[in-house]
Every structure is written in structure tokens, then in C-alpha cells.
Amino acid sequence: TMCSAQDRTDLLNVCMDAKHHKTKPGPEDKLHDQCSPWKKNACCTASTSQELHKDTSRLYNFNWDHCGKMEPACKRHFIQDTCLYECSPNLGPWIQQVNQSWRKERFLDVPLCKEDCQRWWEDCHTSHTCKSNWHRGWDWTSGVNKCPAGALCRTFESYFPTPAALCEGLWSHSYKVSNYSRGSGRCIQMWFDSAQGNPNEEVARFYAAAMHVNAGEMLH
């Protein structure tokens, strides 16, 4: 079942109300490296895009290397995930209101293309972590996330035995793994070549339309 984005009528070309997002999407010529596909229309600034590529960036003081050095092939997926989170103006249909000190809105159940999830898991399952949900439960006493007492570092595969366990569990169901494939127009791509435009615009349009139809049916 599709959930409606609570109280939001503007589901297309919108930015989430969160810590570093712009209030209105627009061009950002100087987006850095992995965030550059969103140059033509972005919810992130160039400085945010620059900062999120750093280890333990000032954006969230989040340390990817909490269990030793994360493999570069793995880390690039987390950078791309953060680019999508900070920069995408095409996630309106999945915005939900939350009562958190650091943000008023979050994404929930964004349908991530199955290949993007599979590749993320394959590239990460030999890196190490100590938790299966990275939203909560960390030891923040040092100002940076550390493994809580007694939480053992093990391979990603131990904490995330399947691709879905990673993509859906990691950020408390911000994503759900779609049965659709990249290029179908029915799932969000974390990775895309902007030379062909942003494929996620079409996906947002499809789900926004479906949500309006559903909302209409509920009214009658």
C-alpha cells in the first residue's frame, strides 16, 4: 500500500525540511564529485556536497570507519546514498513528518532500484560494522558515533545477511527494495548518468500521480 506524504500537496520538485537542505531546489553548478549528477536541479549546496565526501564530515559527525577502514568500494555507496538524501528534489512522494531535534521531515520507503541495492550490498559485505540500524543506538559521548559497549564489529554480511536487510534496515526503512529495475521509471536510482537527464523525475511523477489517485479514492 502506498502511504501519502503527510499534509504535503507538493510532491514534485521539492526539498525536504531537514538539517542541511535548501528550501527550494535549483541549479548548483559546483556540486562535488559523486553529487554532480544533481547539478541541474538540487536540494543541496556545493559546500554540503563537498563536506559529505569527507570522512566524519561536519554535516553529521558520522564516522563510516567505526570498525576500521571501510573499503573504498563500499564507502562510495554511502557517499552516493548521502548525495541522494541531501540533493534529490525527486523524493517528495516519500516525505514524512517527524519529530526530531535535527529535522522535521524524513524519507520513508523510497523504492530503491533492486540493482542499486544489490551492488551496494555486494561491495560492502566484507567491510565491518557493529550495528544493523545506523539511525540510533550509537555512543555519541565523544561527539562522533562509536560502537556502543559490547556491540562487536563483524562483517556487514553478519549484520545485513541480505541486500534488503542492508538497504531497508540501515536507515530505519528510508528505502524499500523495489522489484523494479533501473531504467524502468518505477524505482529510484541512487546512481545515474546526468547526461541522459535525471531518471528519478519520471519516477516521482508516477508515484505522485498514483498517490493522488489513491487519495481521491479514499475521499469517495
Epitope: C67, G68, H125, T126, H128, C130, C147, A149, G150, A151, L152, C153, R154, T155, E157, S158
Partner: antibody
Framework: EVQLVQSGAEVKKPGASVKVSCKAS????????MHWVRQAPGQRLEWMGW????????KYSQKFQGRVTITRDTSASTAYMELSSLRSEDTAVYYC???????????WGQGTLVTVSS | SSELTQDPAVSVALGQTVRITCQGD??????ANWYQQKPGQAPVLVIY???NRPSGIPDRFSGSSSGNTASLTITGAQAADEADYYC???????????FGGGTKLTVL
Amino acid sequence: EVQLVQSGAEVKKPGASVKVSCKASGYTFTSYAMHWVRQAPGQRLEWMGWINAGNGNTKYSQKFQGRVTITRDTSASTAYMELSSLRSEDTAVYYCARDISYGSFDYWGQGTLVTVSS
Amino acid sequence: SSELTQDPAVSVALGQTVRITCQGDSLRSNYANWYQQKPGQAPVLVIYGQNNRPSGIPDRFSGSSSGNTASLTITGAQAADEADYYCDSRVSTGNHVVFGGGTKLTVL
């Protein structure tokens, strides 16, 4: 570079106890589990037990329950395995090993030969 | 039972492919890990989890599993592969670990 360095060989009398140490370096000691495995001459590897180096929780093989005690000193990044009531069948090389995935041991100590002889 | 069973000895011609197997009930719900041990040395992890090779392990080593049987395959065996090979696996009840009896691999 991850290293596990064990204490030297020991010769013990039957009925005595032995305590083997395993000093870890090159990683955050408290973030990983440490296991102990032994191998009698010409025999298979035999799992003895493990310790969560973060909180000190332990699990022991049924076979050694009551005779083995695994401890750790976080300030020294060192794990210890003590085996009591030694008998000749306990003559073996004792290894410590770091666990990365429920029994996947990616780094091993060099081994400590314990000989039990009257 | 929490036993893991391996063939005591297996031989392979230089350059050929060999499969070493490990059987046990715990393998129905847990992956096997594989270790290579040469005389007088500590074991070395060669395959763990689904089919993961630690860095430095040649890609001629691979792992697979089906039902209660796990297999280690060496494709194009080298003289340096002559060693004892042990499987182990987690026993879910109680978070214990069990080792197989070991397989002595001879490269002819």
C-alpha cells in the same frame, strides 16, 4: 597491521593450571570477539570458547565448561585463556583468533605449545 | 548433532580442480568458513561467509553451499596449496563454533 602475539611455551604437571596470553595490536581491541582454539599433535582444531572483548561476556565449549576461563584486560589489549586440572590429553598448541563473523577467524596468534607431563 | 564431517584425505593433479566438502546439520542455517593450515603454522582463513576471500587469498579458491554441505573448490591447484583444510561453522544454539576433522590435500 593487525597482530596477535601469544605468550611462550609452557610445561605443566598434571592437575596444574596454565594461563596463556594473547596481546592484540593494530585494531580496536574492544570492538571484536576473541576466540581460543587448540590443536593436539596430529589432531583436528578444537574450539574452546570466546570472549566479547567489549563487555567481557564469554561462551565456552561444553567440553571445557568448568575447566576453562577466558578473560581480558582492555587497558593492555590482551586476552587470556586459563585451563585448570590439566591432564596429558591437554598437551596441544593453543591459539587465540579474532572473530569477524560468527566463527570466521581472520587473524590468529602464532600459537602457544602447552605440554602436560609428569 | 553439531559435528562437521570432512573426508580425511583428497589428492589432485597439479593444475586440476579439486573440491573439498564439509557436511553437518549446522550448515543448513550457517555458512562454513575454510582454513588452510601448513605444518607448524597457524591456520589461515581462505573463504568465509557466502563466498568471501580475505585479501591476499588467490581467486582460485572459492566456496559454495547446498543444504547441509559446504564445499571449498580450488581451480587449478598449485603445489603451494598442499596443506590441511578445515571447515568451521557457527552452531546457532548458544553461539558456539564447531570445526570439521580436516582434509589433507595432496597435490600430485
